[in-house]
């Protein structure tokens, strides 16, 4: 970026620069015509027959440097070829010299500073690349010369530029004084201010654009070079704050629109609000949950909002003496979460009718809460009690919801006490293919024994398919179709109105090897 300090092409009034000495053949201000056919103010000098050692000086007005350390001067000039000038003396030149003088104010006069090198500082002797020449009978031809010089380092408030002619025939068509600065730059959401380079390279600290935050690491900086260019180097830069996304080629942060959000700073764009949430304002870092929906503390800010599940369905109970197997179906509505668990609440009512929360003598397998599978086995039920179980489904947001937790109830009334185990089995007769068994009638606490169930299998054959059952209403039974000379394990249980009692201990019996032995009565 170039900042102009002076451009004679843009001047409409006379320049009225100072010349020295006040003699004929001095620099003269004239109107000229530039390449764009615009009238411009120019200075011309053409004293090619001057006395040796005599110089013509031209000095600009005072130019404030505006913080520039190095200033560039672009000169556009034409120069006549000495060879084309028949009356030119040996002192005819095709060069001129440029100087500058620094001061803190416009203090120069017609005579001061002294018109010489030191106090003036020489910049360069400028030679023409293109000479205007004329040959007899031909047009004069020539081109404009363009030369850019560098002044500095400058330290005072301003300066004058001076031109010294020592015998050239030339015109200064325009003078453009400017300095170079690094233009304001926004890159990676980092703004680097307009910077005038004071040295070869100057480090410049960047600042995050509005609604951006510094990225981790060193604070962003770029180098401004003396030529007004930013040095190419990676910028750690900044990133948009939560609720904002990068826009316009990573030069600004734009607030997330309504209905969108961005939870974290950094790259990435605003996303539509997740399920069951909304953002009614722009610039949302998080979307608010709809009424009745929640996020668990451990849920990411960008997670959908969820709700507690509905009640489990279809609770099925299977009572077996003092044990109860409960099984149910998952709730219709999971609430949108995967972390579904179940819990049970239990109340028990005595035969007399007084009810209370279940006592500690009940055991739940796997447990009364945090169940991940839809079943539980409850043990230790008392006979002739009525139990009410409430099965609830829970998830990670159940604790955030207010109001009652939906549940599915199930009532179970236990039977009166079942008969005790049958243990004193004896073999009354055996043959190669049958066994006759008998046992003592157990004392049933809740009414008479209605019947018995005999369970038997060959010893060593223990799979479910080898087990056989036999029901009998008497306290004896005959097992037929057995293998010759085989050992059998037998258990018996009794049933009353309260249900089956437990199987007794296994009883070991053996069939006869052959028929000749006949029936043999075995007494236990």
């Amino acid at each position: 970026l170039e900042e102009t300090l002076l451009n004679t092409k843009l001047e409409t009034a006379d320049l009225k620069w100072v010349t020295f000495p006040q003699v004929d053949g001095q620099w003269e201000e004239l109107s000229g015509l530039d390449e764009e056919q615009h009238s411009v103010r120019t200075y011309e000098v053409c004293d090619v027959q001057r006395a040796p050692g005599q110089a013509h000086w031209l000095r600009t007005g005072w130019v404030p440097r505006r913080g520039a350390v190095h200033v560039y001067a672009t000169l556009r000039f034409t120069m006549l070829e000495c060879l084309s000038l028949p009356r030119a003396g040996r002192s005819c030149k095709e060069t001129f010299t440029v100087f500058y003088y620094e001061s803190d104010a416009d203090t120069a006069t017609a005579l001061t500073p002294a018109w010489m090198e030191n106090p003036y500082i020489k910049v360069d002797t400028v030679a023409a690349e293109h000479l205007t020449r004329k040959r007899p009978g031909a047009e004069a031809t020539g081109k404009v010369n363009v030369k850019t010089l560098r002044l500095g380092p400058l330290s005072k408030a301003g300066f004058y530029l001076a031109f010294q002619d020592q015998g050239a025939c030339m015109a200064l068509l325009s003078l453009h004084l400017f300095y170079k600065k690094c233009a304001q730059l926004t890159v990676n959401l980092t703004r680097f201010p307009e910077t005038v380079p004071r040295e070869l390279v100057v480090p410049v600290a960047g600042s995050c654009v509005v609604d951006a935050v510094p990225a981790p690491g060193p604070s962003p900086s770029l180098y401004c070079r003396e030529d007004g260019q930013w040095a190419e180097q990676p910028v750690t830069g900044c990133s948009c704050a939560p609720g904002f996304e990068a826009a316009e080629g990573n030069t600004k942060c734009r607030a997330c629109a309504q209905g969108t959000f961005k939870p974290l700073s950094g790259e990435g764009s605003c996303q539509p609000c997740p399920a069951n949430s909304h953002s009614n304002t722009i610039g949302s870092a998080v979307c608010q949950c709809r009424v009745g929906y929640f996020r668990a503390r451990t849920d990411p800010r960008g997670a959908p909002c969820t709700t507690p599940p509905s009640a489990p369905r279809s609770v099925v109970s299977r009572l077996n003496g003092s044990s109860l197997h409960l099984e149910w179906s998952a709730p219709l509505e999971s609430g949108g979460r995967e972390d579904l668990t179940y819990a049970l609440r239990c109340r028990e009512c005595r035969p007399g009718g007084s009810c209370a929360p279940c006592g500690g003598d009940l055991t739940f397998d796997p447990g009364p809460r945090d169940l991940v599978e839809p079943w539980v086995v409850v043990r230790g039920l008392r006979p002739d009690f009525t139990y009410t179980f409430e099965v609830t489904a829970l998830n990670g947001v159940s604790s955030l919801a207010t109001g009652p937790v939906p549940f599915e109830p199930v009532n179970v009334t236990t039977d009166r006490e079942v008969p005790p185990a049958v243990s004193d089995i004896r073999v009354t007769r055996s043959s190669p293919s049958s066994l006759s068994l008998a046992w003592a009638v157990p004392r049933a606490p809740s009414g008479a024994v209605l019947d018995y169930e005999v369970k038997y299998h060959e010893k060593g054959a223990e799979g479910p398919s080898s087990v056989r059952f036999l029901k009998t209403s008497e306290n004896r039974a005959e097992l037929r179709g057995l293998k010759r000379g085989a050992s059998y394990l037998v258990q018996v249980r009794a049933r009353s109105e309260a249900g089956y009692g437990p199987f007794g201990q296994e009883h070991h019996s053996q069939t006869q090897l052959d028929e000749s032995e006949g029936w043999r009565e075995q007494l236990a």
Epitope: G32, C46, L80
Partner: antibody
């Protein structure tokens, strides 16, 4: 503002010569083109030739080649036009005119003449 | 030398009229063409140079156009002081030439 002041009217015999002067006042002289233009009574303008004093040599219209000489004296900022072998048809007002821009201060060869002398009447009569 | 032909040689017009004068060169002269106005007993006055550049101090009702061989001077609204003779002038080579002139008279 530059002024071009020409010498006075002349009456000449056929076959003779006439030298008309044109003095420029104020500022640069050497690098402007000075043209000579004549106008016979009731006729149009006729370009005769021009000189850029710093270069010394002049350019002439074919019609006047060999009969006209244009010179310049940089020390007095004066240009001259001498026409020889005068004929009656050379009776005319002779103007000197200066170009708008110097040879150094224009990018184009416009040679537009924006300063004119007052004119010098040359009468050729026997 | 390059020949310059102006047309018309004369024209009659009223104040306020739009007037157009043309000038044709015998060969390409790019835009190296000037226009002058001359009133009786006076030296010519430069109006336009470089085919279309208005000389400082000349009213904007005067305009020029063209390049190559065909050129035009236009007076958009003729004023009483514009009645004069107008000349084109080519400066393309070392030998300048004028057109024969166009006289603009009051109708």
């Amino acid at each position: 503002q530059v002024q071009l002041v020409q010498s006075g009217a002349e009456v000449k015999k056929p076959g003779s010569s006439v030298k008309v002067s044109c003095k420029a006042s104020g500022g640069t002289f050497s690098t402007y083109a000075i043209s000579w233009v004549r106008q016979a009574p009731g006729q149009g303008l006729e370009w005769m030739g021009q000189i850029i004093p710093i270069f010394g040599d002049a350019d002439y219209a074919q019609k006047f080649q060999g009969r006209v000489t244009i010179t310049a004296d940089e020390s007095t900022s004066t240009a001259y036009m001498e026409l020889s072998s005068l004929r009656s048809e050379d009776t005319a007002v002779y103007y000197c005119a200066r170009s708008s821009y110097t040879i150094l201060t224009t990018y184009y060869n416009y040679n537009a003449m924006d300063n004119w002398g007052q004119g010098t009447l040359v009468t050729v009569s026997s | 030398d390059i020949q310059m032909t102006q047309s018309p040689s004369s024209l009659s017009a009223s104040v306020g009229d739009r007037v157009t004068i043309t000038c044709r060169a015998s060969q390409n002269i790019n835009n190296f063409l000037n226009w002058y106005q001359q009133k009786p007993g006076k030296a010519p006055k430069l109006l336009i140079y470089g085919s279309s550049i208005l000389q400082s101090g000349v009213p904007s009702r005067f305009s020029g156009s063209g390049s190559g061989t065909d050129f035009t001077l236009t007076i958009s609204s003729l004023q009483p002081e514009d009645f004069a003779v107008y000349y084109c002038h080519q400066v393309s080579d070392t030998s300048d030439t004028f057109g024969q002139g166009t006289k603009v008279e009051i109708k």
